[in-house]
């Protein structure tokens, strides 16, 4: 109970040039603390200094990357200080260019199934880190496979549950500077589908339209979905609309597609605001075909 707890806010992964707050918390409420860095480059602003409650560190440079501990003031201890805290590893991003992050077979994963997250780069990274947004625990460390064109890692994730769904990013690093990371990959939203019953999808004025004609796709369900998501087969991304309660007791969203030039297979999903990465089963596919246009898909 005398050992303090060190944490980093908003997290341990910090972009170069940004700030991070190191907070040393004593379970007995002693507010003053000292900070030490165990590895990497020295950080002069830590030495012979007493901090109170927290320390705003930055603008962060690669020199700030490394392992930190704190000791809290402790009037009952012979030295006046507590035992050292837990270690906190600060990783600085933006030192190398960003890798790419993909999901195979895709980012919409059926509940209970497995998805492979692939992080790759034309830089020869010996290590990759996989990080989920909103999680304060350390990112997952993965060993990269090196090849002539660069490096990559495949991470098999599953069985899929709402707890695993979320926004992922990956980073690359080299062995001799393990806490200096690349810029983050573009975010990848992994969504678990099949948690609730499927909504129904219909088209107004109908699923077959003249080229240039307006069409609206309506997604509806008796489930209390807050949000509907419309996706087109073989296209990344989706349209998203808030559900509206209709007189007939259904929750509906109308997606105006505007003047259409070519068709495709559409599906929609329902979800709740509280669990944005957990979606329903897909609606039955709705083929929208466009006449008077050589391209139907």
């Amino acid at each position: 109970q005398d050992k303090p707890f060190l944490s980093a806010w908003p997290g341990t992964v910090v972009s170069e040039g940004q700030h991070v707050t190191l907070q040393c918390r004593s379970r007995l409420g002693f507010n003053e603390f000292s900070l030490s860095k165990e590895d990497g480059m020295p950080v002069p602003e830590l030495y012979n200094r007493i901090f109170r409650n927290s320390f705003l560190m930055g603008p962060v440079t690669p020199a700030h990357a490394g392992t930190y501990r704190c000791c809290s003031s402790h009037p009952h201890s012979p030295t006046g200080w507590s035992a050292p805290s837990n270690p906190v590893v600060i990783m600085v991003t933006g030192v190398h260019r960003k890798p790419s992050l993909l999901a195979h077979p895709g980012p919409l994963v059926k509940s209970g199934e497995t998805v492979i997250l692939q992080c790759w780069s034309d830089v020869r990274f010996e290590r990759f880190l996989l990080h989920r947004e909103g999680i304060t625990e350390d990112p997952l460390r993965l060993v990269g496979q090196l090849h002539d064109a660069g490096s990559q890692v495949n991470y098999s994730m599953g069985p899929m549950t709402p707890a695993l769904a979320g926004t992922y990013r990956c980073f690359g690093s080299v062995t001799h500077l393990p806490y200096e990371l690349s810029a983050p990959s573009d975010p990848l939203d992994i969504v678990v589908v099949g948690l609730y019953g499927k909504p129904s999808l219909s088209a107004q004025p109908g699923p077959t339209v003249q080229a240039g004609e307006n069409v609206t796709l309506s997604c509806s369900s008796r489930s209390l979905f807050d949000i509907y998501h419309l996706s087109r087969e073989a296209e990344a991304g989706e349209l998203r609309l808030t559900a509206v309660l209709r007189v007939n007791g259904t929750f509906q969203a109308n997606f105006p597609l505007g003047p259409v030039t070519h068709g495709g297979n559409y599906r929609c999903f329902g979800s709740f605001r509280a669990l944005p990465h957990a979606w329903s089963d897909p609606s039955d596919p709705l083929p929208v075909s466009v006449t008077g246009n050589s391209r139907h898909l």
Epitope: Q1, D2, F5, S7, R27, G29, S54, H76
Partner: antibody, heavy 122, light 97 residues
Framework: QVQLQQSGPEVVRPGVSVKISCKGS????????MHWVKQSHAKSLEWIGV????????NYNQNFEGKATMTVDKSSSTAYMELARLTSEDSAIYYC???????????????WGQGTSVTVSS | LLVSAGDRVTITCKAS??????VAWYQQKPGQSPKLLIY???NRYTGVPDRFTGSGYGTDFTFTISTVQAEDLAVYFC?????????FGGGTKLEIK
């Protein structure tokens, strides 16, 4: 289940001392620090201090230094708080409360005793 | 605060200096001890209904009851446990019409 059982109400004369107790059960007593809180009409809730149930180390709110003394008896899983030289301003309900645990750092308090009413009256 | 069942209620709490996210919210019903609802500004404590939410960072914090129910009649306190001595807000009494 976790329980904090406090001693009964006290009606005392000004100038005397009173010692109230708080017995923990349903959990490992020495794993969690114990806080004491005063509730009066005049000042709502006031944090008095915290004690390590493991080794008896303490940290007091300066406003209660010399007024409150916190102790623990590990063998009986009981925390005590003695209030000295009582005046009418000490009339209040006093709560013991266990720190919340579970994620490395123990913040806030999640279990409270039922409170001990102390009335100072001549 | 005088509210009707079904109303949405928001209570605010302002710290005199940054307390990062070290804020807890407690509910105290008449004749009872306080109960922890929210810790770390936004984390709902075990068993607390999801109509209770908290948010904020730094100096400004908010506690919301999305749909007030009759059993929510109580006094609500915020507390900072960033720096000792830990301090409580004066409390907000919620009364149901």
């Amino acid at each position: 289940q976790v329980q904090l059982q406090q001693s009964g109400p006290e009606v005392v004369r000004p100038g005397v001392s009173v010692k109230i107790s708080c017995k923990g059960s349903g959990y490992t007593f020495t794993d969690y620090t114990m806080h004491w809180v005063k509730q009066s009409h005049a000042k709502s809730l006031e944090w008095i201090g915290v004690i390590s149930t493991y080794n008896g180390n303490t940290n007091y709110n300066q406003n209660f230094e010399g007024k409150a003394t916190m102790t623990v008896d590990k063998s009986s899983s009981t925390a005590y708080m003695e209030l000295a030289r009582l005046t009418s301003e000490d009339s209040a309900i006093y709560y013991c409360a266990r720190e919340r645990g579970g994620d490395g750092y123990y913040s806030a308090v999640d279990y409270w005793g039922q409170g001990t009413s102390v009335t100072v009256s001549s | 605060l005088l509210v009707s069942a079904g109303d949405r209620v928001t209570i605010t709490c302002k710290a005199s200096q940054s307390v990062i996210n070290d804020v807890a919210w407690y509910q105290q019903k008449p004749g009872q001890s306080p109960k922890l609802l929210i810790y770390y500004a936004s984390n709902r404590y075990t068993g607390v209904p999801d109509r209770f939410t908290g948010s904020g960072y730094g100096t400004d914090f908010t506690f919301t009851i999305s749909t007030v129910q009759a059993e929510d009649l109580a006094v609500y306190f915020c507390q900072q446990d960033y720096s000792s001595p830990y301090t409580f807000g004066g409390g907000t009494k919620l009364e149901i019409k």
